[in-house]
């Protein structure tokens, strides 16, 4: 069965700016990934960045920069002034599109009491639908 | 069938200000992010900005930040492009495209004319 | 910002010929990541919003003829016209579809004798 992991992380230089890190661990090949916060994508959450494989990258403030790691990973860092930047309990989304598996979703926030610049390894988060 | 319809031609003066529209319909709107692009007569095509309808959250090529802003009505699945401060330099054919640029709308002509 | 160079900036063939254009790019587009480079070509014909024909510098968008091929890597690419039709008659741009602004070339206007 396929799944997504999320990590986020909340940078020590810069204790308003997080960077969130997602994950497909599955055999099909990615057509979408689409990162929200405030919930899943669709659900009342809001998106940040979609990410193409060969049709590019968009991304909206806060995100500063969106990009692709490897070709079932991505990441995320997100500015964090003004109103609409992050809090610590602020929850972030990853959805993967993919064929022929379909949509994946997993969510995830700081983990508590987290030092800054410091976040657990990435682990499968649970996994809130599968379309 | 996706279809982007923009309003039409619009004549205005220099230091005024326009507000053009892209209804959008074939698809859901909120879904798709909406890309604003300029092309002078006879010039190439330049990228304006970008606005997510889920959120308002928008993307600004410098060169028009505090010229264009990018809004939209969710209700009306409607994107707007305001221009201020109207110059020659501004006259063109605008249009707006859904993320991708795989969609584009027909076009509006802006003429800034004393 | 990346700047895109197109060449030649026009050019007149007769029907039937085979055509390349050029476009190169100040930065390259390739996302190491993915290995895939994020490159657009449009044809735009005359009273007409642009078209797009390929992404990804060489997937072809649904319903685009396959006598349009794209090709290249990094910062030179390639947009090949097999066999040219009357209605190929076209300005054609590239776009840096790799990171804001998303810059495009002048354009290759395509002439048919």
């Known amino acids: 069965t396929p799944e997504v992991w999320v990590q986020v992380r909340m940078e020590a230089t810069e204790l308003s700016s997080f960077t969130i890190r997602c994950g497909f661990l599955g055999s099909g090949s990615i057509s979408l990934v689409t990162v929200s916060w405030g919930g899943p994508n669709g659900a009342g959450g809001t998106t940040l960045a979609v990410l193409h494989p060969e049709r590019g990258i968009r991304q909206w403030a806060p995100a500063r920069q969106a990009r692709w790691e490897t070709q079932s990973s991505i990441s995320l860092i997100l500015e964090g002034s003004g109103a609409s930047s992050p809090c610590a309990n602020t929850t972030f989304c990853c959805k993967f599109a993919s064929f022929p598996e379909g949509s994946w979703e997993a969510c995830g926030s700081l983990p508590p009491s987290s030092d800054p610049g410091l976040s657990a390894p990435p682990t499968p988060a649970p996994i809130l639908r599968a379309d | 069938e996706v279809q982007l319809q923009q309003s039409g031609p619009e004549l205005v003066k220099p230091g005024a200000s326009v507000k053009i529209s892209c209804k959008a319909s074939g698809y859901t709107f909120t879904d798709y992010s909406m890309n604003w692009v300029k092309q002078s007569h006879g010039k190439s095509l330049e990228w304006i900005g970008d606005?997510?309808?889920?959120?308002?959250?928008?993307s600004y090529n410098q060169k028009f930040k505090g010229k264009a802003t990018l809004t939209v009505d969710q209700s009306s699945s409607t994107a707007y492009m305001e221009l201020r401060s109207l110059t020659s330099e501004d006259s063109a054919v605008y249009y707006c495209a859904r993320i991708w640029f795989a969609y584009w709308g027909q076009g509006t002509l802006v003429t800034v004319s004393a | 910002d990346i700047v895109m160079t197109q060449s030649p900036s026009s050019l007149s063939v007769s029907a039937g010929e085979k055509v390349t254009m050029s476009c190169k790019s100040s930065?390259?587009?390739?996302?190491?990541?993915?290995?895939?480079?994020?490159l657009a070509w449009y044809q735009q014909k005359p009273g007409q919003p642009p078209k797009l024909l390929i992404y990804g510098a060489s997937t072809r968008e649904s319903g685009v003829p396959d006598r349009f091929t794209g090709s290249g890597s990094g910062t030179d690419f390639t947009l090949t016209i097999s066999s040219v039709q009357a209605e190929d008659l076209a300005v054609y741009y590239c776009q840096n579809a790799h990171s804001y602004p998303f810059t495009f070339g002048s354009g290759t206007k395509l002439e048919i004798k």
């Open positions: 606005i997510n309808p889920d959120n308002g959250g928008t």
């Open positions: 930065q390259s587009l390739l996302n190491s990541g993915i290995q895939k480079n994020f």
